[in-house]
Amino acid sequence: KIDACKRGDVTVKPSHVILLGSTVNITCSLKPRQGCFHYSRRNKLILYKFDRRINFHHGHSLNSQVTGLPLGTTLFVCKLACINSDEIQICGAEIFVGVAPEQPQNLSCIQKGEQGTVACTWERGRDTHLYTEYTLQLSGPKNLTWQKQCKDIYCDYLDFGINLTPESPESNFTAKVTAVNSLGSSSSLPSTFTFLDIVRPLPPWDIRIKFQKASVSRCTLYWRDEGLVLLNRLRYRPSNSRLWNMVNVTKAKGRHDLLDLKPFTEYEFQISSKLHLYKGSWSDWSESLRAQTPEEEPTGMLDVWYMKRHIDYSRQQISLFWKNLSVSEARGKILHYQVTLQELTGGKAMTQNITGHTSWTTVIPRTGNWAVAVSAANSKGSSLPTRINIMNLCEAGLLAPRQVSANSEGMDNILVTWQPPRKDPSAVQEYVVEWRELHPGGDTQVPLNWLRSRPYNVSALISENIKSYICYEIRVYALSGDQGGCSSILGNSKHKAPLSGPHINAITEEKGSILISWNSIPVQEQMGCLLHYRIYWKERDSNSQPQLCEIPYRVSQNSHPINSLQPRVTYVLWMTALTAAGESSHGNEREFCLQGKAN
């Protein structure tokens, strides 16, 4: 009932709680002397469903049959309307429409850990929309029945707060859940299980790893488990991997040897436990243990390349370069590289340890036969040395690869292609493609990149250390025994017109012609490989088209003669530079007047 109902009553038949689809009779009746004061025939009783008027009647009582009520709670209010006054609330009633509970399904129980508590879950089925009480019962082998009730609206879980013991792990327990509301009751099918079926062990803890004699091949994983655990599964992976290695072990007693770990690798380890071969469930995975395996001596050999530079008639500079070993080859932190330089005929050898660099430069006589060996060392030992005989890499003209081309291939890639040398192509043992940023000064500090290609390949895609809008000097070497031939080309992955033209720094007169000198365009403004320079000139104050002279770009060139100027005429000169994408803006303008005699 909604309020004190002093003036009358609202009764509901058959009940305030009804099954969906049922009909109810609602009666509103006034108590004696509670009608309209002047004329009781004027009593007008009105029945509201929530705020909507659904029926009215003149007199002391009103009967209304109501059908089609929705699931949930519906509020009915009866009011009295008298002439010349507001409606007065008489009484009200709530009607609860719902359904009987469905049979609870999929009842299952679990105990987390040997010391945990038994809890069960089930599926309620469709919502009853009514207050429904669930009672969970558990009968055990000790002739005790446990019972717990739940009065939440959405009850599908109960914890008994007790702990099943493994005194007789094969003894049966039976659980059953019963749902009861005003419209009926329903019980689940009984669920019968043993201790071993429902106990889910706690995840293992205190995980440790030991490496005997600091060796990756003698590795044991240790952990602690609950007392009854029979099975474990281990999973482990390198920290940078998504794929797990899995191992199942029986009666491990908290230890297991791992035989397939890689050296100098951080691994993540996790363990899970189970009480029985085919009963029960696996525990959650343990917290991860992260550990790094010990180093082993490096495997593999360094990829070594070199560059020779003529210094003077008796000396040459040798620059050695090598690539880092891959992580799987280094098998530890590389502490230093050992470089040995030896003159083969005289047997003189010099060894040096290099730390922090992957290159080494030295000066040697131009005479003699020289060889180098380079190896990488970590705390456990050294890699096998890579041996190279120093030779003149471009000496054999007949070994020079032909028709070398370099073309942009997508973002920051250059496809280099060539034809085999004229000399017997089968003599080629390997090709080496080398590239470095083009610097007009021929700076030897510029990093060198290279890749090796099999003798039957006639192309290579270079992508390492390739930047857009930078010109690269690319060489293809064909190597055969102690001979080599090479061809070179310039290439870029992406280009556009240069950002500026060359800066003319001097114009000098020589025997009736002039020599123009300029400063190179800064590398970052070249925007790719330069193909040509253009020198423009025209008479000062003239509106005629300028004349021009186009010069093929050569790295070291920074002057050029022009002999078509008239004496005693003042000219304005400027320069531009071109890539395959177009021409730069003008460089600076210079005026010049040739002093020589007129022809």
């Epitope: 010391q115 005790l144 019972q147 009730q149 008994f160 707060g161 007790i162 702990n163």
Partner: nanobody, 129 residues
Framework: QVQLQESGGGLVQAGGSLRLSCAAS????????MAWFRQAPGKEREIVAG????????YISDYMKGRFSIDRGNAENTVYLQMDSLKPEDTAVYSC??????????????????????WGQGTQVTVSS
């Protein structure tokens, strides 16, 4: 020290009912569990029923299931044992027991009298045929 006081025992005819009550001198919330045990002459003490105070889990011997029930009623420090359809073999001294604090008890522990640490004097129930 928790004192437990049983009442409600007596003589009853077979098929009759009794309601035993156990009043604790401390609030029952301070206790982990309260239970009823019985001991017939010449027999061992056996569990009848109990209740875990915090979660409201009840436990009852399968021999008495359907005839006996345990509840806390409305009184904060009292538990009741409702006994219906009594039989002559239900004749025994009925004692109230309490466990003040605990970790999670096991199903075995909770049915054993030694697990409980406070006991009442007991009340006699006699069922005549």
């Amino acid at each position: 020290q928790v004192q437990l006081q049983e009442s409600g025992g007596g003589l009853v005819q077979a098929g009759g009912s009794l309601r035993l009550s156990c009043a604790a001198s401390a609030r029952t919330e301070s206790m982990y569990a309260m239970a009823w045990f019985r001991q017939a002459p010449g027999k061992e003490r056996e569990i009848v029923a109990g209740i875990i105070q915090s979660g409201g889990t009840t436990y009852i011997s399968d021999y008495m299931k359907g005839r006996f029930s345990i509840d806390r009623g409305n009184a904060e420090n009292t538990v009741y044992l409702q006994m219906d359809s009594l039989k002559p073999e239900d004749t025994a001294v009925y004692s109230c027991a309490a466990k003040v604090s605990s970790g999670t008890p096991s199903d075995i522990q909770i049915s054993q009298s030694r697990w409980y640490d406070h006991w009442g004097q007991g009340t006699q129930v006699t069922v005549s045929s």
